[in-house]
């Protein structure tokens, strides 16, 4: 058992151009806090995967207000260390995620709001009991300087906190073969007493009295080599005929992982993949509980009352993420139907409906044509917003009451002349142009640009637009 300790030295703009704007302002004073997440081994895992070694939240730092016009300085930090206790052996290699969070303290509705300012991650080797290791990590334009160490909690000692110490039995020296317990020189290292007869080469123990075998060895004292060449079944009793001894029950049999953790076998033992909120060799330790206030932006912490239960955050509308840390663009879900305009007012979503539609989500199609007539043989089209008339040729306007002049919009290009016609309009093209709207130049050699003139029509002939 022991404690991983993290000391944040500074958080501020990194070197080089593009200094970040201060995250705080006179209008929005803020303060920082940090979260650390530890995982065993050097696996490159997603930020959302469980903090199997543990997690910790810092206290809030001092309130900071930007001085107008000043560049972003190093920001004031919370006091004290972030401490992540570990119950089992220190793994020696670990991955970390350190998140810098901003708590805004302005007058926004709902009190403080939280946002993730920076996240750094790394993979390191570290022996327990060693000196502080210093590190610098950059996230975008921000730079985080910190130190960390792992220390064992007495009576554990050693680089993995697996050796135990006990008070000296004799005042002057330790017993035969036993060393003093640095830094507790007045104590002696207590040998971890494995099961009597456990092979010192092929067996090991993590608890007194046990004997666990390295890969390739089996038997109660790990003295029997495992031959796999003629083994047909992966597990079972030893076969006297083949001389093949297959290991008995596997380390994951009976699932030693608590709290819904999933077990996978490793060369030396087993490994538990723990659900969110739990860590430890058997997922028996909860890293963060509701008492730590892990739900941001007005989220409600549910469960997680004690270290044996994981918390979840119920997020207010507009936020998501396991800690309600992500703001949702609720309009991106396109909740407004029928072309309505979405407005996220913070306290509510509003849909501004197109004419002809109504309802909280513009879901009701008003009967546009009820009691409305289209003149001059026009027909009313339902559902297109404010009642729409499809007018007969030669008529236009909202109710088809206006006589349409098809040439009013000057539809003939390149100086072509427009003629109103009972079936539409006709363009008489200027020399060198052709097409329904005189849009195509005629090449000097007589070949036209696309499209070709239809058979029987010479370039320059008036073409009726149908």
């Amino acid at each position: 058992a022991g404690v991983f300790e993290l000391q944040i030295h500074s958080f501020g703009p990194g070197p080089g151009p593009g200094a970040p704007r201060s995250p705080c302002s006179a209008r929005l004073p803020c303060r920082l806090f940090f979260r650390v997440c530890l995982k065993p081994g050097l696996s490159e895992e997603a930020a959302e995967s469980p903090c199997a070694l543990g997690a910790a939240l810092s206290a809030r730092g001092p309130v900071y207000t930007e001085q107008p016009g000043a560049p972003a300085p190093d920001l004031p930090l919370p006091d004290g260390l972030l401490q992540v206790p570990f119950r089992d052996a220190w793994p020696g290699t670990f991955s970390f995620i350190i998140e810098t969070w901003r708590e805004e303290l302005g007058d926004q509705i709902g009190g403080p709001a939280w946002s993730l300012l920076a996240r750094v991650a790394g993979r390191r080797r570290l022996a327990a009991g060693g000196p502080w290791a210093r590190d610098i990590q950059r996230a975008g334009a921000w730079e985080l300087r910190f130190s960390y160490r792992a220390r064992c909690e007495p009576p554990a000692v050693g680089t993995a906190c697996t050796r135990l110490c006990r008070p000296r039995s004799a005042p002057s020296r330790c017993g035969p073969g036993l060393r003093p317990c640095a830094p507790l020189e007045d104590e002696c290292e207590a040998p971890l007493v494995c099961r009597a007869g456990c092979s010192p080469e092929h067996g090991f123990c993590e608890q007194p009295g046990e004997c666990r075998c390295l890969e390739g060895w089996t038997g109660p004292l790990c003295t029997v080599p495992v031959s796999t060449s003629s083994c047909l079944s992966p597990r079972g009793p030893s076969s006297a005929t083949t001389g093949c001894l297959v290991p008995g029950p596997g380390p994951c049999d009976g699932n030693p992982c608590a709290n819904g953790g999933s077990c996978s076998e490793t060369p030396r033992s087993f490994e538990c993949t723990c659900p969110r909120g739990f860590y430890g060799l058997r997922c028996e330790v909860s890293g963060v509980t509701c008492a730590d206030g892990p739900c941001f932006n007005g989220g409600l912490c549910v469960g997680g009352a004690d270290p044996d239960s994981a918390y979840i955050c119920h997020c207010p509308p507009g936020f998501q993420g396991s800690n309600c840390e992500k703001r949702v663009d609720r309009c991106s879900l396109q909740p407004c139907r029928n072309g309505g305009l979405c407005l996220d007012l913070g306290h509510a979503l509003r849909c501004r409906c197109r004419a002809g539609f109504a309802g909280p989500r513009c879901e009701h199609d008003l009967d546009d044509c009820a009691g409305r007539a289209c003149a001059n043989g026009g027909t009313c089209v339902e559902g297109g917003g404010a009642h729409r008339c499809s007018c007969a040729l030669g008529f236009g306007g909202r109710d088809c009451r206006e006589r349409a002049d098809p040439c009013a919009a000057r539809p003939c290009a390149h100086g072509g002349r427009c003629y109103a016609h009972f079936s539409g309009l006709v363009c008489a093209c200027a020399p060198g142009y052709m097409g329904a709207r005189c849009e195509f130049p005629v090449h000097p050699d007589g070949a036209s640009a696309l499209p070709a003139a239809p058979p029987g029509l010479r370039p320059g002939d008036p073409q009726r637009y149908l």
Partner: antibody, heavy 117, light 108 residues
């Protein structure tokens, strides 16, 4: 502004199920969490539970085995069912909307007295 | 669960006086997730304060909230006749949501 109106029988027999409905007007039921709170005569307020339009629910552990809260988005209503009632469940039952900035109650119905007898 | 204890249970005061009501939590209320409500006789509670110190829409500025951690207060700077009612605090840091049992303000 959101308005809420509770409805349901004012008298329920012991061991039966209390059923109440809250009708929401002036806002979409899809925009908020919706909650039930009760207050026995002359006593403290007690939160019963809440529901979100997506179906997410959360109940007071003291009532969890007996309570069901559901939502009907098409009618802009949500409802409470409390089974195996006793005289101790006699109270004024309020429906309320939960604010979008946290789990406090910004709009309340006027309340309906339910007597178990 | 977080138990909220309000004190005093009843206060007898006169209009124009200043009053401070206390709400103490059995455990730390994180992020100042605490609200105050006013309940007049025969009416539903009405939201006054959220986030420990933010006034709800339409609430007069004579009402103010403060505090953090486990100790919170509601202050009414000058009592008006309509302020005589029962006042409740509620935490929304963690489930279950809990209320205090109220402080009754009565006219002396």
């Amino acid at each position: 502004q959101v308005q809420l109106q509770e409805s349901g029988p004012g008298l329920v027999k012991p061991s039966e199920t209390l059923s109440l409905t809250c009708t929401v007007s002036g806002g979409s039921i899809s925009s908020y969490y919706w909650s039930w709170i009760r207050q026995p005569p002359g006593k403290c307020l007690e939160w019963i539970g809440y529901v979100y339009y997506s179906g997410t629910t959360n109940y007071n552990p003291s009532l969890k085995s007996r309570v069901t809260i559901s939502v009907d988005t098409s009618k802009n209503q949500f409802s409470l069912k409390l089974s195996s009632v006793t005289a101790a469940d006699t109270a004024v039952y309020y429906c309320a909307s939960i604010a979008v900035t946290g789990f406090y109650f910004d709009y309340w119905g006027q309340g309906t007295l339910v007597t178990v007898s | 669960e977080i138990v909220l204890t309000q004190s005093p249970g009843t206060l007898s005061l006169s209009p124009g006086e200043r009053v401070t009501l206390s709400c103490r939590a059995s455990q730390r209320v994180n992020n100042n997730y605490l609200a105050w409500y006013q309940q007049r006789p025969g009416q539903a509670p009405r939201l006054l304060i959220y986030g420990a110190s933010s006034r709800a829409t339409g609430i007069p500025d004579r009402f103010s909230g403060s505090g953090s951690g486990t100790d919170f207060t509601l202050t009414i700077s000058r009592l008006e006749p309509e302020d005589f009612a029962v006042y409740y605090c509620q935490q929304y840091d963690r489930s279950p949501l809990t209320f205090g049992c109220g402080t009754k303000l009565e006219i002396k």
